[in-house]
């Protein structure tokens, strides 16, 4: 902890300026008044300070704001930024685009992964929902971070805020979120005609049921086989061979180069041999002629 | 000890560039300011700008913006000046500072002179 | 930009002489005020900062004062090894700016 001295009078600060560059740590705790340095923190960022002397100004905050900082201050953070702990973020309240912009600007380049999403947290739940401008903001200064969110803060995301969500935008999106999302796509993109829904609704297809995805079978969709592997696994389990052939098209040949990973590993369990030879890329692992197929699991349900 | 080991001399042609190194050693690197100054002959002392190490942090003398670019390198615990566009009144001793313990330009590289002739 | 000025270029002291270097700032500077000294071949060396503060390992015949616009470098015994060219600068605000220099010499 900072150690706690008397201010010399000739370092008393009366605004915060380049000067305080060569203050020591102590002198900054002593001399440098918490109220003071809120009041001018848009200074702050202009200033070269060392991590050690924002670790001071952060202290001075924190004793200021035990319950989290104003937006006022947030938003002028900006280097001071990288010293906030995503425990520290979570005490705020951030409702201003603006604020969100320049603090993402700041994290680039840093690992902070965690304060960020915890910052965009913040945000969701200040504005109330994840609204266009949002997603705007967030596609434009942090791809990537929408997946960031809860499902359960993805769940305020209006479908028509849907169409702004670039592909690249859920790249690192996992299965519970796309299952959030997957709906307001479908809902979104409902009047496109076949080959335009199918462009828009791929980036969003892991969060797709077994139905829909035997309905895009019946489409000539030709999916390609990096879409196929992100579907969900209980999604393509039911798939027949038949509709796996339709709905790949001429990437079916992949198939060969994925059998050992999930979820083709797993399909290629629960298909008869017979049918996965129909394929003629020699696919092994399938359920051999003869055997006959019990599903357990209703027996245990009934059970 | 504190120790600040700059590169050496440099003679180098008008519009080519330059960057001379400092390498900083006895103290944790990325913890204190790095400060660059220009000292033409029988001239004084000219501030160009600071890097903070630790975040690449730069601020310029306004003279110097265009004109010399400062970085830094954590793994190896050194500062860069690059000097562009160079004319004849770039030919100076040019030295790093460290601004060690929050003092202002405590400890001083040995200079670097660079020559801009034809 | 602050300018720093050191109106003397030249100074004549003896050993054991008390001498006092003057600089002046365009502006109140707050005491944001260096000094330092540099021998021909060497680098420059940090002797006082914040007008009056000793840098580590500087000796106590060297003091700083001053407050405003006008500060001073003061050797109280002046010694042989003294004889170099001292330099004050502000540290208040960027660009740091420097004064001329003032150089002392043997009588």
């Known amino acids: 902890d900072v150690e706690r001295t008397t201010c010399p009078p000739e370092k008393e600060v009366h605004e915060i300026d380049e000067s305080l560059i060569f203050y020591k740590k102590r002198e900054l705790e002593a001399c440098v008044d918490a109220a003071l340095l809120a009041a001018q923190m848009d200074r702050v960022d202009a200033i070269p300070f060392t991590y050690e002397q924002l670790d001071v100004l952060k202290h001075k905050l924190d004793e200021l704001y035990p319950q989290g900082y104003p937006e006022s201050v947030i938003r002028h953070l900006g280097h001071l930024f990288l010293k906030m702990s995503p425990e520290d973020i979570r005490k705020w309240n951030v409702t201003s685009l603006e604020t969100l912009k320049a603090l993402l600007k700041v994290s680039k380049g840093h690992e902070m992964s965690a304060q960020v999403a915890t910052l965009i947290d913040r945000v969701v739940v200040g504005r109330g929902q994840l609204d266009k401008d949002t997603v705007d903001t967030l596609t434009a200064f942090c791809p990537g971070c929408l997946c960031s969110l809860s499902p359960e803060r993805l769940s305020s995301v209006p479908p028509s805020v849907i169409g702004a969500v670039r592909p690249q935008d859920l790249d690192t999106c996992g299965p519970r979120q796309l299952d959030v999302l997957y709906p307001k796509a479908r809902l979104a993109f409902q009047n496109m005609s076949g080959s335009e829904y199918f462009v828009k609704i791929r980036p969003f297809l892991g969060g797709a049921p077994t139905e829909d995805v035997k309905a895009l079978s019946q489409q000539n969709v030709s999916m390609d086989l990096a879409t196929f592997m992100k579907l969900r696994r209980e999604a393509v389990l039911p798939l027949t061979v038949a509709e796996v052939q339709k709905l790949l098209g001429p990437h079916v040949e992949g198939l060969k180069v994925e059998e050992q990973h999930s979820p083709v590993r797993d399909w290629i369990l629960k298909q008869r041999q017979d049918d996965l030879d129909t394929l003629g890329l020699g696919l092994q692992g399938g359920i051999p002629n003869g055997y006959l197929i019990l599903d357990l699991s209703v027996r245990e349900a009934l059970s | 000890q504190v120790q600040l080991q700059q590169s050496g001399a440099e003679l180098v042609r008008p519009g080519t560039s330059v960057k001379v190194s400092c390498k900083a050693s006895?103290?944790?690197?990325?913890?204190?300011?790095i400060e660059w100054v220009k000292q033409r002959p029988g001239q004084g002392l000219e501030w160009i700008g600071v890097i903070n190490p630790g975040s690449g942090g730069t601020k310029y003398n306004e003279k110097f913006k265009g004109k010399a670019t400062l970085t830094a390198d954590k793994s190896s615990s050194t500062a860069y000046m690059q000097l562009s566009s160079l004319t004849s009144e770039d030919s100076a001793v040019y030295f790093c500072a460290s601004d060690y313990d929050y003092d202002p330009f405590a400890y001083w590289g040995q200079g670097t002179l660079v020559t801009v002739s034809a | 930009d602050i300018v720093m000025t050191q109106s003397h270029k030249f100074m004549s002291t003896s050993v054991g002489d008390r001498v006092s270097i003057t600089c002046k700032a365009s502006q109140d500077v707050s005491t944001a005020v260096a000094w330092y000294q540099r021998k021909p071949g060497q680098s420059p060396k940090l002797l006082i900062y914040w007008a009056s503060t000793r840098h580590t390992g500087v000796p106590d015949r060297f003091t700083g004062s001053g407050s405003g616009t006008d500060y001073t470098l003061t050797i109280s015994y002046m010694q042989a090894e003294d004889l170099a060219l001292y330099y004050c600068?502000?540290?208040?605000?960027?660009?740091?700016?420097f004064g001329g220099g003032t150089k002392l010499e043997i009588k």
């Open positions: 006895g103290y944790a690197f990325t913890n204190y300011l």
């Open positions: 600068q502000q540290h208040y605000s960027t660009p740091y700016t």
